[in-house]
């Protein structure tokens, strides 16, 4: 009886089990009742990542540095390409087709997460007893200066975007 | 249905070299190979070679390596074996085969080498 | 390459007889796939070959079940249980398992 269902990593085709084609290599010719299936490498800049009965290999995705991107892992016969971006800039998506520039923490804002290949800048609000009074990318909010450490009271209070003022206290008149 | 026309009979010339055809009708014809087998007068069967009409891939028997040339032309669904330098040794029946849900062969040609 | 040996040569049978043709290959059979390229088919006078059972065993769409093939690695047979004037001819056997692919010399198949 001719089969209905194969084993993994065959296919069904004119009633017989055909082996499929390991990752990295594409299908020529499926196998008949006197052959094997024959399967061949893919190309320099192609891939095929699964177990297959693929004609054609997929082509190397290309890092267009035009769009900012650059290779951070060399495609293989079985992998494709992964692309990321230059110094200063993430993917606008997961796939990583383009490049965006990383944003600035405004002052009164600090970095919570430094911004990476593939995510932006994450910001958070300087909370009481921090500021931040640059517009950065790097720069966490800082704490405030503590006067006492240093024998001066505050003169001035700070805010999330000013740090406090320190002075000397006032003598004591007898 | 599938069917695997050849001509009846070739006659040529020693030395001379020789185009056998085999039309492939009723399948897609780059989905399959088309294999060539030789049979001499009351001899046994011998084969030749095989080519993959989707990329013009071939696989040999050695010993007919320098002696034929397989071809396809896709837009009329024909496969071609050219003998080359022949001899009274290559007179026999050309059979053009295909596999495959199913074996088909075709009627087979007459090669016949005589000055 | 690979040798295929048929015996025998010729085989006189009467109408309604078992006949039995053997075949054996100078090297086994068995491709690394776990599939056994032998294959068996007839040929009758001025025809072209025509296949009977694939890879030891399997018959063809629309051969009789009177015709069954067994064996494994060298040493194969076809049996042929009731035998009818329409099966006479040569039978020939042949691999494709290693390349090049080889085929029997043929046993002949005749009325006693």
């Known amino acids: 009886e001719p089969p209905t269902a194969c084993r993994e990593k065959q296919y069904l085709i004119n009633s017989q089990c055909c082996s499929l084609c390991q990752p990295g290599q594409k299908l020529v010719s499926d196998c008949t009742e006197f052959t094997e299936t024959e399967c061949l490498p893919c190309g320099e800049s192609e891939f095929l990542d699964t177990w297959n009965r693929e004609t054609h290999c997929h082509q190397h995705k290309y890092c267009d540095p035009n769009l900012g991107l650059r290779v951070q892992q060399k495609g293989t016969s079985e992998t494709d390409t992964i692309c990321t971006c230059e110094e200063g800039w993430h993917c606008t998506s997961e796939a990583c087709e383009s490049c965006v520039l990383h944003r600035s923490c405004s002052p009164g804002f600090g970095v919570k997460q430094i911004a990476t290949g593939v995510s932006d800048t994450i910001c958070e609000p300087c909370p009481v007893g921090f500021f931040s009074n640059v517009s950065s990318a790097f720069e966490k909010c800082h704490p405030w200066t503590s006067c006492e450490t240093k024998d001066l009271v505050v003169q001035q209070a700070g805010t999330n975007k000013t740090d406090v003022v320190c002075g000397p206290q006032d003598r004591l008149r007898a | 249905q599938v069917q695997l026309q050849q001509p009846g009979a070739e006659l040529v010339k020693p030395g001379a070299s020789v185009k056998l055809s085999c039309k492939a009708s009723?399948?897609?014809?780059?989905?399959?190979?088309i294999y060539w087998v030789k049979q001499r007068p009351g001899q046994g069967l011998e084969w030749i070679g095989g080519?993959?009409?989707?990329?013009?891939?071939?696989n040999f028997n050695e010993k007919f390596k320098s002696k034929a040339t397989l071809t396809v032309d896709k837009s009329s669904s024909t496969a071609y074996m050219q003998l080359s330098s022949l001899t009274s040794e290559d007179s026999a029946v050309y059979y053009c085969?295909?596999?495959?849900?199913?074996?088909?062969w075709g009627q087979g040609t007459t090669l016949t080498v005589s000055s | 390459d690979v040798v295929m040996t048929q015996t025998p040569l010729s085989l006189p049978v009467s109408l309604g007889d078992q006949a039995s043709i053997s075949c054996r290959s100078s090297?086994?059979?068995?491709?690394?796939?776990?599939?056994?390229?032998l294959h068996w088919y007839l040929q009758k006078p001025g025809q072209s070959p025509n296949h009977l059972i694939y890879?030891?065993?399997n018959r063809f769409s629309g051969v009789p079940d009177r015709f069954s093939g067994s064996g494994s690695g060298t040493d194969f047979t076809l049996k042929i249980s009731r035998v009818e004037a329409e099966d006479l001819g040569v039978y020939f056997c042949?691999?494709?398992?290693?390349?090049?692919?080889?085929f029997g010399g043929g046993t002949k198949l005749e009325i006693k």
């Open positions: 085969t295909r596999h495959g849900n199913g074996v088909y």
């Open positions: 009723g399948y897609t014809f780059i989905s399959y190979y």
């Open positions: 080519i993959n009409p989707r990329n013009g891939g071939t």
């Open positions: 090297q086994s059979l068995l491709h690394s796939n776990g599939n056994t390229y």
């Open positions: 890879q030891v065993s």
């Open positions: 042949s691999q494709t398992t290693h390349v090049p692919w080889t």
